[in-house]
Structure formats: structure tokens, C-alpha cells
């Protein structure tokens, strides 16, 4: 018996990310006796819920239970039954639900009430469903990537966990792109901030962090596209919209009522002489880029420096991890390599957008046409947002690292959210390391 390792005391946690376009369930695990250590929590499963985001269920709330079933059943299988009752479940809803709440608190409440009732039926320790703030979304994303990169650890390592991990303890900034919002979060060089709304103070593992964060609601890739369409149709002479952000030969009919459904297009709303219009792609990156830039108001800034729309942005500092849709889109376009310069990315985008739609469909036969058709816009939008929106340059581009996973865990706000709610990030550095679970007796 002397060589037998003690059975691991493992804990689990579940976080559902109720995004604007879809919901994902994440299962995390960690050794119980190490829960205050940095870097011990890791993701064991991601389950993508089939269907759109929960905000789209406002007209069919009775279907929410079925919608969540598959992934919740998957969690039941993955987590040992003996652990079910002590496994916390959290659901955080992001910008899609913020937009629904903006239109109607009642409808947002109704969706969340049904979600809560559905999740309460499972044998886990359900901790509630809520709409998280944009500030939280940014902050938890920043905590996640720095936790996974080992930036909060006081032990300096002679090795690197991931290729872009530097040995210093300088934190990475976080760039998150969703369907309805985008977040930028980092530690600026200057501790003082001109905009208290964008300032966060953390004490983590015995160190103080003064963090800048902002969430741009309506500037996720899907809502940005709706904004662009609403802006461009204003000046269309008829119900044909010749759009440089779609491939040549691409055609799609859009209902005006769908266009004006979101609060994001409110500023462009006007009475049009038609109920529908047709997008006709012309595939021109440069023109698409110009059209996208019109979504960013850079003419007004009440601070020393702004991102866009009068929002304070301090000078960029250090390396940044760009995740979620930043990664998904750039990965599809094969542009995530550290070796690809900003100029090269622009060149590749020009080439991609100009490719005929029929050719694109043939080349990417396995990809859903709805998603496939929007990569030209999304790639262009990402470049515009990073360069003109956040003021990255050709030189500072190399400080952006497009990250999908870090050590097997998805980059995103969910891990940071769970770490915070389970009190697994201590303010002070733990004094002594408990015995590891691999100790032999």
C-alpha cells in the first residue's frame, strides 16, 4: 500500500456563457486542497448548446428547457455523481441580454426566470442566472487569461507553458470580441485614470492591479454588421445594397424590420420606401474598411485620448491576448500566426474578400453559408477595430496574440467569473503550499 497515491479530492464547477449568438457550457475541475493556488483550475469540457442565444427565445420561452437539456445532461455524465450536489452552476448572460433588457426589462426577466427554473431542475448546486455587466465581462476575461498564463504566480519558472508566455510577471491585456459587444482590458503604464468608470482595482495573490476596461455594446461583430447595413441602406437609391463587405456574386435578402429590431441600429433608423432589400456583394476590402470606419466616431473626445465614440482609452501597454471571435475569425482566415505582420493580414484580407462567392463556397464546402458569407466583413471589422478603434499600429500588432485556448482551457470570461464566485483567487499570496495530491504515504 505504500506506493498507492491517495485518491484525488477533485472539485468541479460549471459556467454557462449565454452569449448573443449562442450559449456554451464549460466544466472546470481542480484539486480541492490546491484551490487557492494559481493555475490549478482547468477546463475539462466545453459543450456548445444547439440553437441561438437565449435572448432569441423571448417568443418561445417554453423551449428553453429543451434547449439546455443536451449540455446539462453532458455535465451530468462528465461530473461524477457523488460530486453533483456540491458542483456550483453559474449562468452569465452578456450583451445579447443587455440589449434585450434595454428594450424591455420584463422580457429579459422572463427569459432569465425560465432559464433559472430549467437549471434548478438538475442535481447540481445552481447559483443563479444573471446579466453580467460589460465591466465584469472585460475584467473576468483579463483574470482568465492571466491566471492561465501563470501571471499571478510568484514562482518564476525557467520554462514557458505556452509559446507567447514571457517569464516576467507583466500581465497580458485582454481583447474579447463577441457577437454584440467587444471588451478591451489592460494595465496601463500610468496608474491614474481620467475616467473612473473605466477603472478597476484588484488585489490578487498579494499584488495590486490598476486595470483599465471598457465594453463597447453594439460593437460585437454581428451587431456591428447590423449597424453597417442600417447606415449604408440610408443612402441606397433603391432596394439593392451593393456591399463591398460581401464576396462578388453573393446575394441575400434582408427584412427592414429585422434590421431595426436591435437598439444598435436606432441612430440609423429611418422610414424606407421598401420592406426588404437585397445585399449584392462586390468584395472590395478597401471600400469595406472605409464603410466600417464610419461606425467609429473619432471626431469627439473629452479626454486626452479616446478609442472611439468619446470613450477614454489610455496608451496601449504590453502584450494582448485576443480571444473569442477575434480568434475564431482570424483562425478561419489562417491569420493567427505570430509571424504574420499587420501588412500581410491586410493583404490577405484584400485577396480573400475579392474572391467570388461561388469559389468561396466550393473551397469551404463544410462551412455553413451564413457564417462563411460574413468572414470578409468580420476580418475587415477586426482590423478596423484594432487599428483605428484601439489604435494598434503595424509595430504594436506583434503584441497581439490570437488565442483560442491556453493549456486546454478556453480564453474567455467564464473561468475568471467562476474563480471569483468560488473565492478561488485570494487577495493575498497563500503563506504555505499544502501537500500536493501526489504525495505518497
Amino acid at each position: 500500500t505504500q506506493n498507492k497515491a491517495l485518491p484525488e479530492n477533485i472539485k468541479y464547477g460549471i459556467v454557462l456563457d449565454a452569449g448573443s449568438s449562442h450559449t456554451s457550457l464549460y466544466i472546470y475541475k481542480w484539486p480541492a486542497e490546491k484551490e487557492n493556488d494559481t493555475g490549478v483550475v482547468h477546463q475539462v469540457e466545453e459543450c456548445r448548446v444547439k440553437g441561438p442565444g437565449i435572448s432569441k427565445y423571448v417568443q418561445k420561452v417554453n423551449e428553453i428547457g429543451i434547449y439546455l437539456t443536451d449540455c446539462m445532461e453532458r455535465a451530468r455524465e462528465v461530473i461524477p455523481r457523488s460530486q453533483h450536489q456540491e458542483t456550483p452552476v453559474y449562468l452569465g448572460a452578456t450583451a445579447g441580454m443587455r440589449l434585450l433588457r434595454m428594450e424591455s426589462e420584463e422580457l429579459a426577466d422572463r427569459v432569465l426566470d425560465v432559464v433559472e427554473r430549467s437549471l434548478s431542475n438538475y442535481p447540481f448546486d445552481f447559483q443563479g442566472a444573471r446579466i453580467i455587466t460589460g465591466q465584469e465581462e472585460g475584467a473576468y476575461g483579463w483574470i482568465t487569461i492571466n491566471y492561465l498564463l501563470g501571471k499571478f504566480s510568484q514562482k518564476t519558472r525557467w520554462f514557458s507553458i505556452v509559446p507567447y508566455e514571457t517569464n516576467n510577471q507583466e500581465t497580458f491585456g485582454a481583447l474579447d470580441l463577441g457577437g454584440a459587444s467587444t471588451q478591451i482590458t489592460f494595465v496601463p503604464q500610468n496608474q491614474t485614470t481620467e475616467s473612473p468608470d473605466n477603472a478597476l482595482q484588484f488585489r490578487l495573490y498579494g499584488k495590486d492591479y490598476n486595470v483599465y476596461t471598457h465594453s463597447f455594446l453594439c460593437y460585437g461583430k454581428d451587431q456591428a454588421l447590423w449597424q453597417k447595413l442600417a447606415k449604408d441602406i440610408q443612402v441606397a437609391s433603391n432596394e439593392i445594397l451593393r456591399d463591398p463587405c460581401f464576396h462578388p456574386g453573393y446575394k441575400k435578402v434582408v427584412n427592414v424590420s429585422d434590421l431595426y429590431k436591435t437598439p444598435c441600429t436606432k441612430r440609423f433608423e429611418m422610414t424606407l420606401p421598401f420592406q426588404q432589400f437585397e445585399i449584392q456583394g462586390i468584395g472590395n476590402y478597401q471600400q469595406c474598411h472605409q464603410s466600417v470606419l464610419e461606425l467609429f466616431n473619432t471626431s469627439y473626445c473629452p479626454y486626452s485620448q479616446c478609442a472611439f465614440n468619446g470613450i477614454f482609452l489610455p496608451p496601449l501597454q504590453g502584450d494582448f491576448g485576443a480571444f473569442s471571435a477575434f480568434y475564431f475569425v482570424m483562425n478561419f482566415l489562417n491569420l493567427t500566426s505570430e509571424k504574420v505582420s499587420q501588412e500581410k493580414v491586410t493583404e490577405m484580407m484584400k485577396k480573400f474578400c475579392s474572391q467570388p462567392w461561388e469559389e468561396i463556397k466550393t473551397s469551404y464546402a463544410g462551412v455553413k453559408e451564413k457564417y462563411l458569407s460574413e468572414y470578409c466583413f468580420s476580418g475587415t471589422y477586426i482590423l478596423s477595430l484594432l487599428l483605428q478603434g484601439y489604435h494598434f499600429t503595424a509595430d504594436s500588432w506583434e503584441h497581439i496574440h490570437f488565442i483560442g485556448k491556453i493549456q486546454g482551457s478556453d480564453a474567455g470570461w467564464t473561468l475568471g467569473y467562476m474563480l471569483n464566485l468560488t473565492n478561488m483567487i485570494p487577495a493575498e499570496q497563500p503563506l504555505s503550499t499544502p501537500l500536493s495530491h501526489s504525495t505518497y504515504v
Epitope: S104, E106, L107, A108, R110, T133, P263, T265, K266, R267
Partner: antibody, heavy 115, light 111 residues
Framework: QVQLVQSGAEVKKPGASVKVSCKAS????????MHWVRQAPGQRLEWMGY????????TFNQKFKGRVTITVDTSASTAYMELSSLRSEDTAVYYC?????????WGQGTLVTVS | DIVMTQSPDSLAVSLGERATINCRAS??????????MYWFQQKPGQPPKLLIY???NQGSGVPDRFSGSGSGTDFTLTISSLQAEDVAVYYC?????????FGGGTKVEIK
């Protein structure tokens, strides 16, 4: 806690304009719409319109269309309601109220007297 | 426009007794299974205070004696046991459709 603080009382001549401000605190200003409601002496409450602070888009009660302008300064978390071509029947208390469809938070009101 | 008609215009009730106010909408204010119906209390010199939202949900910090019921076009606000501090004007409101509209108000007094 959520607070909406409005500017002080105004006395205006007929034909003039008035601009009332509403400073918000205790929440993310761009996450909620801001409505304007007025109440003439002894009258029912009357909804005037709202603005989406996020982007400045607005919707008005047709009764006031062309006379009312609602704007925001997001950096100051402040909404403004301007009513032009004032007449005596515009004498009322003007309120701002936060909400999508639920007016849970109201400013203290601004009395505008037209005489 | 949706017209909101409140009844009665005024109501005198003894302390501790039940007060009932009705509101009728000229068309249904229900949508997606939710009633976009609200009740407000307004005291002299004060802004309205939200009592009930979604026809039957109590606003934050509202005493349990206030309750709302109804759906579609007919709604009721009930004060189960009238207190001295409940003397006020009560308004109903719909936000199903623009322009959002209010009822004419019901003045509640103590008998």
C-alpha cells in the same frame, strides 16, 4: 444606488426654448434608455419620448414631434430634453425616467413655467 | 394610441380596509406572454413611484399590501389594508406600444 438628478426650475417666455438636464449615476449609463415624461398641473402624466444613450437614437410621442429634442452626453452620464416654441400649456413638471419598458427610477422633476 | 381608462377617479377608504382601483386599456397590452402594465403611486411634490410592473410583480421595496392582477385589457391594483401613508394619486401605464400612455389617475383618501 441609481440616482437621476435634474436641473432646476425654469421660467420661460412663450416662443422660447427650454433645455432640462438629467444626470445619472449608480449604473452604466449606456445600458438603459432614458425617457422623458411631463405632468401639467392637475393633469395625467404624459410620455414625451426616449433616447438610447448608447448611440443617440430616439423615439418621440408624435404630439411633440418637431418640438422636442433629446440628446445625451455619455462622458457626463447626462441626458437632455429641449422643448422649443413654448406655449402656456407647456407649463408642467418634466421628469426623466430610466427604463426600457419599466420606469423604476425617476428624477425629482423640473418645473418649467411658461408665462 | 392605446387609451388607458382608470376608475374610479377618487376613492375614500377607511384605515385598514381594502382599496381597489381598475384600469382598462383600449386594446391588449400583452405581448410575448408579458403584460406591459404598470402601477405608480404619486404623492404631492414627488415623482411617481413604481409599485407594480408586468401587471402583478411588486417593485423594489414596495409593501406586500400592494398587489396587481389582470391581463389583456383589464387590470386591478389592490391595497389590502389601507395605511395613512397610502394617501396619494395612483396611475396605470402601458408600455406595449409607443406612445406609452398613462391613465387619468385615481385619488385615494381616508374615509
Amino acid at each position: 444606488q441609481v440616482q437621476l438628478v435634474q436641473s432646476g426650475a425654469e421660467v420661460k417666455k412663450p416662443g422660447a426654448s427650454v433645455k432640462v438636464s438629467c444626470k445619472a449615476s449608480g449604473y452604466t449609463f449606456t445600458d438603459y434608455n432614458m425617457h422623458w415624461v411631463r405632468q401639467a398641473p392637475g393633469q395625467r402624466l404624459e410620455w414625451m419620448g426616449y433616447i438610447v444613450p448608447l448611440n443617440g437614437g430616439s423615439t418621440f410621442n408624435q404630439k411633440f414631434k418637431g418640438r422636442v429634442t433629446i440628446t445625451v452626453d455619455t462622458s457626463a452620464s447626462t441626458a437632455y430634453m429641449e422643448l422649443s416654441s413654448l406655449r402656456s400649456e407647456d407649463t408642467a413638471v418634466y421628469y426623466c425616467a430610466r427604463g426600457g419598458t419599466r420606469f423604476a427610477y425617476w428624477g425629482q422633476g423640473t418645473l418649467v413655467t411658461v408665462s | 394610441d392605446i387609451v388607458m381608462t382608470q376608475s374610479p377617479d377618487s376613492l375614500a377608504v377607511s384605515l385598514g380596509e381594502r382599496a381597489t382601483i381598475n384600469c382598462r386599456a383600449s386594446e391588449s397590452v400583452d405581448n410575448f406572454g408579458v403584460s406591459f402594465m404598470y402601477w405608480f403611486q404619486q404623492k404631492p411634490g414627488q415623482p411617481p413611484k413604481l409599485l407594480i410592473y408586468g401587471a402583478s410583480n411588486q417593485g423594489s421595496g414596495v409593501p406586500d399590501r400592494f398587489s396587481g392582477s389582470g391581463s389583456g385589457t383589464d387590470f386591478t391594483l389592490t391595497i389590502s389594508s389601507l395605511q395613512a401613508e397610502d394617501v396619494a394619486v395612483y396611475y396605470c401605464q402601458q408600455t406595449k406600444e409607443v406612445p406609452y400612455t398613462f391613465g387619468g389617475g385615481t385619488k385615494v383618501e381616508i374615509k
